[in-house]
Amino acid sequence: APVRSLHCTLRDAQLKSLVMSGPYELKALHLQGQDLEQQVVFSMSFVQGEESNDKIPVALGLKAKNLYLSCVLKDDKPTLQLESVDPKNYPKKKMEKRFVFNKIEINNKLEFESAQFPNWYISTSQAESMPVFLGGTRGGQDITDFTMQFVS
């Protein structure tokens, strides 16, 4: 069966939107009005992995681009990157481990935990226009909570 996907945008708990910053990086900043058109639209695919009521494995691709968020070890540190893939083969139900995130719903907020690096989360900084990154702490200064807006 083909993998089920939906299109959405994400905003962090401070209501910052995610936009492209160069070819292989996302940054988070406040957008208003027509500038909201800059925000990236994700193709969120529901993939194979350990699932529970509040934890669902997903892959996060960029709509109409052959780019996926992936988590790899760089200089011995878990790192978030945008990775190019062959569009003929993606998305697929069985994604490689580095592409899988556990979408965790808590109090109407979403967290995205790396399946490859447990307790590491897609994160944004409090500061404006900083890169989206993989962070190893929750509840600290960095933001790990998001809301999702469906896009038709």
């Epitope: 350990e50 083969n89 490689e96 481990k97 690096f117």
Partner: antibody, heavy 120, light 107 residues
Framework: EVQLVESGGGSVQPGGSLRLSCAFS??????????VGWIRQAPGKGLEWVSH???????SYNPSLKGRFTISKDTSRNTVYLQMNSLRAEDTASYFC????????????WGQGTTVTVSS | DIQMTQSPSTLSASVGDRVTITCRAS??????LSWYQQKPGKAPKLLIY???KLHSGVPSRFSGSGSGAEFTLTISSLQPEDFATYFC?????????FGQGTKLEIK
């Protein structure tokens, strides 16, 4: 020191089954990011990745196997298994287990291999 | 599946020579490539990972380079213990696939 030791190989007729074991020491398959794979090598041929299991139980298989093989683990016994069913002559090979950590994979430590012969 | 093609299949060289083995992928595999050495009757040994990172304990005469779809393993000055078969492995996409191997033999 990391060690992996394969066992369970032998001769079997086409259509038969075998279960290979990979007993390991020096690391734990409950450590996040840890994985163990099976790689085989037909006599005089190259290497072919067969299957893989991650610390969290996530499994992957080479689609060329068409669902005939199943990988599993017993974390408490430090052992990974490869159940091979509906064996064919082309499954004749040395089967190695190997350890990796994280995706993308590279196999850091290997066992010495166990030989599987499928022949009538 | 991603096809990995190694060249040459066999390479004759002498001690002290500089040799290069090439591995080509059928599509872009980023830098998700590793190299292994195997001697007859033995298990493979990891030499290089992430295209160019030397595995611990591997002599510095071994080096790796490349990106995208073309990669090389270079041995700067062949030693007697280097005569073996060498394989590349791509980790970009499942199923993970090896090159067919390059046998390095004494000239």
């Amino acid at each position: 020191e990391v060690q992996l030791v394969e066992s369970g190989g032998g001769s079997v007729q086409p259509g038969g089954s075998l279960r290979l074991s990979c007993a390991f020491s020096g690391f734990s398959l409950s450590t996040s990011g840890m994985g163990v794979g099976w790689i085989r090598q037909a006599p005089g041929k190259g290497l072919e990745w067969v299957s893989h299991i991650w610390w969290d139980g996530d499994e992957s298989y080479n689609p060329s196997l068409k669902g005939r093989f199943t990988i599993s683990k017993d974390t408490s016994r430090n052992t990974v298994y490869l159940q091979m069913n509906s064996l064919r002559a082309e499954d004749t090979a040395s089967y190695f287990c190997a350890r990796n950590r994280y995706d993308p994979p590279w196999f850091v430590d290997w066992g010495q291999g166990t030989t599987v012969t499928v022949s009538s | 599946d991603i096809q990995m093609t190694q060249s040459p299949s066999t390479l004759s060289a002498s001690v002290g020579d500089r040799v290069t083995i090439t591995c080509r992928a059928s599509q872009d595999i980023s830098n998700y490539l590793s190299w292994y050495q195997q001697k007859p009757g033995k298990a493979p040994k990891l030499l290089i990972y992430y295209t160019s990172k030397l595995h611990s304990g591997v002599p510095s005469r071994f080096s790796g380079s490349g990106s995208g779809a073309e990669f090389t393993l270079t041995i700067s000055s062949l030693q007697p213990e280097d005569f073996a078969t060498y394989f590349c492995l791509q980790g970009k996409m499942l199923p993970w696939t090896f090159g067919q191997g390059t046998k390095l033999e004494i000239k």
